[in-house]
């Protein structure tokens, strides 16, 4: 088992990158002197106890920042949040921490990230750009759920 997080960079099909702004992740067009976040990701060590056909269950964090992506309900609506959490602490937990887990599916160069806690809800960015990352159930409409993930070695 890999027991250190891998690092990667993410952009969407419109070449927008993820940037941290006031503890919120937003997707913006890449520009000079901009510093996109580097993603830290690690597979759940309890993979045998999660659904096998939805993708690789991973924890997603921001490299070097002790911040991880999680899903929580606000009212009846699943929302995407950044929480102060060490990704390795999540990895080592005795059970999958579903609120922090995403099924990572790859098709060609495209990656999707589906919430384990809220099946059918995917990390997305609004087609308009400059907006926070969200969770959506509506694939391929006003929101983009396909991302390019490039691993950094």
């Amino acid at each position: 088992k890999i027991d250190t997080p891998q690092r990667g960079s993410i952009q969407d099909i419109n070449h927008r990158v993820w940037v941290l702004q006031d503890q919120t992740l937003i997707a913006v067009p890449r520009k000079d002197r901009m510093s996109p976040v580097t993603i830290a990701l690690i597979s759940c060590r309890h993979v045998e106890t999660l659904e096998k056909d939805r993708g690789n269950p991973i924890y997603l964090g921001l490299n070097g920042l002790n911040l991880c992506l999680m899903c929580a309900k606000v009212g009846d609506q699943p929302t995407l949040q950044l929480k102060e959490k060490d990704i390795m602490d999540l990895y080592n937990q005795p059970e999958p921490v579903k609120s922090f887990l995403f099924y990572h599916s790859q098709s060609g160069r495209n990656s999707t990230f589906e919430s384990v806690a809220f099946p059918g809800w995917f990390i997305a960015v609004s087609s308009e750009g400059g907006c926070p990352l969200i969770l959506t159930q509506e694939l391929g409409k006003a929101n983009t759920t396909d991302f390019g993930l490039t691993m950094l070695f």
Partner: antibody
Amino acid sequence: EVQLQQSGAELVKPGASVKLTCTASGFNIKDTYIYWVKQRPAQGLEWIGRIDPANAYTKFDPKFQGKATLTADTSSNTAYLQLSSLTSEDTAVYYCTRFHWYGSSFFFDYWGQGTTLTVSS
Amino acid sequence: QAVVTQESALTTSPGETVTLTCRSSTGAVTTSNYANWVQEKPDHLFTGLIGGTDNRPPGVPARFSGSLIGDKAALTITGAQTEDEAIYFCALWYSNLWVFGGGTKLTVL
């Protein structure tokens, strides 16, 4: 109010099987893990295993593999422990407990009142 | 399989601070053992007190705290009360299974 209500005491003959129930109220079992624990007189607690009711996947202490079967019915918010090929060694109190994430850690937070199983001819 | 050892019995007085410990046969207890502490009162009434070594769930009084002391996990009750008289079990995680200690019977006289 979160509660785990377990079925009543059982007196069973050696070699038989028994199915114990644990009915949850105040929360949805799909949102947590249900663990089962065995307590024999003057012998402390033993972890039997767990079920994730959202997908029915189970894990066991190896010594209970083959002895215990864990299932759950999310429509009735109930978890089950089935014990087979019973012997006097299985005489004990069996507890279900919720293993729940609170944002920083998992906890054995709420427990059922226990089911006393007596195996005797 | 690992063996988890606790003091069999301790006695304290109301208002005193008492520390219960939990030792592992495999070596030092670490944060990766995610020590949990559970209280048992008469009539099989169990309550979770501490998870992940030092985290307290909602509703558990602040006088209960968890920590690592030397090579052991510890539960400290600061200002013990008569209603804290109970049996206290620790549980340690060993990568793929939980092992409970034998329990400490705490008397508050």
